[in-house]
């Protein structure tokens, strides 16, 4: 049940990431650690790297408020789960600083890709033999 709540939150975050992608020109063009091709069992560690990244509004134009609200939603801590707790103790996952740094557009694309991977794994895990290739 806790894991379900977590994944439902991930699905909602995809929408927020997609909204932010519309305002990518209004974000500070800073390079941020952006995990890609995350190894199995390091998804939650990579997720926390995305959450910790200093994504910021460039404070220009009329979009500042909506951008800041969206960034705040992205950073909101999800409810704790056993899977998340187990992964926190994995010392083999790369540190956030070790991931390649990318500008906001690629950062958001990689964040979305990780969220999709986590949801897909969750959906597949409760279906016998669902993965076809």
């Amino acid at each position: 049940q806790g894991q379900d709540r977590h994944m439902i939150r991930m699905r909602q975050l995809i929408d927020i990431v997609d909204q932010l992608k519309n305002y990518v020109n209004d974000l500070v063009p800073e390079f941020l650690p952006a995990p890609e091709d995350v190894e199995t069992n390091c998804e939650w560690s990579a997720f926390s790297c995305f959450q910790k990244a200093q994504l910021k509004s460039a404070n220009t134009g009329n979009n500042e408020r909506i951008i800041n609200v969206s960034i705040k939603k992205l950073k909101r801590k999800p409810p704790s789960t056993n899977a998340g707790r187990r992964q926190k103790h994995r010392l083999t996952c790369p540190s956030c600083d070790s991931y390649e740094k990318k500008p906001p557009k690629e950062f958001l694309e990689r964040f979305k890709s990780l969220l999709q991977k986590m949801i897909h794994q969750h959906l597949s895990s409760r279906t016998h033999g669902s993965e076809d290739s």
Epitope: R11, D18, S113, Q116, T127, D132
Partner: antibody, heavy 117, light 107 residues
């Protein structure tokens, strides 16, 4: 705003292979999941399957033996092949995007495929 | 496979009416439910995902609720453009499955 458009023959003979292509415009196919759903005349919607931009697939077990979904990122297209068709495969076929993996947020308008000799 | 049962199969209503459509899953699906609107010859449109989250650009008169096996789509004040067929879809497990649809007709 992403748009999807199905294309392919509207008439297929029994025992042959149904082939449809979905062209994606206004967005890149190199992210998200891309699926096919069909609706037989007078019936409800049936999920056929989907493919991720990286090529991993999930199919409806009821069709799995006969279905192949593939993606061509260079053309921004993905396609459906359904082999050994019968009259029961007559339906409107929709292609759709699943950004959220669990639901379909953009659809094509659908194309009617009739299986008949 | 998880079976999705919608009721009613059709409903006649007038502009301004409150319309409620229900969807029942054959087993618990948490909040993994989406609602779509479909008009003849048009592309289906996602209205609600994860039971109650409104898809971007969808009017706030549409709302979704429920969890487990019983779900509801409510249109608070029916507009002329809302006459269509509505489908629910579960995403708790593969294969993804749809309800049989509810047609909202003009009274």
């Amino acid at each position: 705003q992403v748009q999807l458009q199905e294309s392919g023959p509207g008439l297929v003979k029994p025992s042959e292979t149904l082939s449809l292509t979905c062209t994606v415009s206004g967005g890149s196919i190199s992210s998200d999941f891309w699926g096919w759903i069909r609706q037989p005349p007078g019936k409800g919607l049936e999920w056929i399957g989907y493919i991720s931009s990286r090529g991993s697939t999930n199919y409806n077990p009821s069709l799995k033996r006969r279905v192949t979904i593939s993606v061509d990122t260079s053309r921004n297209q993905f396609s459906l092949k359904l082999s050994s068709v019968t009259a029961a495969d007559t339906a409107v076929y929709y292609c759709a995007r699943s950004a959220g993996v669990t639901d379909f947020d953009a659809w094509g308008q659908g194309t009617l495929v009739t299986v008949s000799s | 496979d998880i079976q999705m049962t919608q009721s009613p199969s059709s409903v006649s209503a007038s502009v301004g009416d409150r319309v409620t459509i229900t969807c029942r899953a054959s087993q618990g699906i948490s909040s993994w439910l989406a609602w779509y609107q479909h008009k003849p010859g048009k592309a289906p449109k996602l209205l609600i995902y994860v039971a109650s989250s409104l898809q971007s650009g969808v009017p706030s008169r549409f709302s979704g609720s429920g969890s487990g096996t019983d779900f509801t789509l409510t249109i608070s004040s029916l507009q002329p453009e809302d006459f269509a067929t509505y489908y629910c879809q579960q995403a708790n497990s593969f294969p993804l499955t749809f309800g049989g649809g509810t047609k909202v007709e003009i009274k």
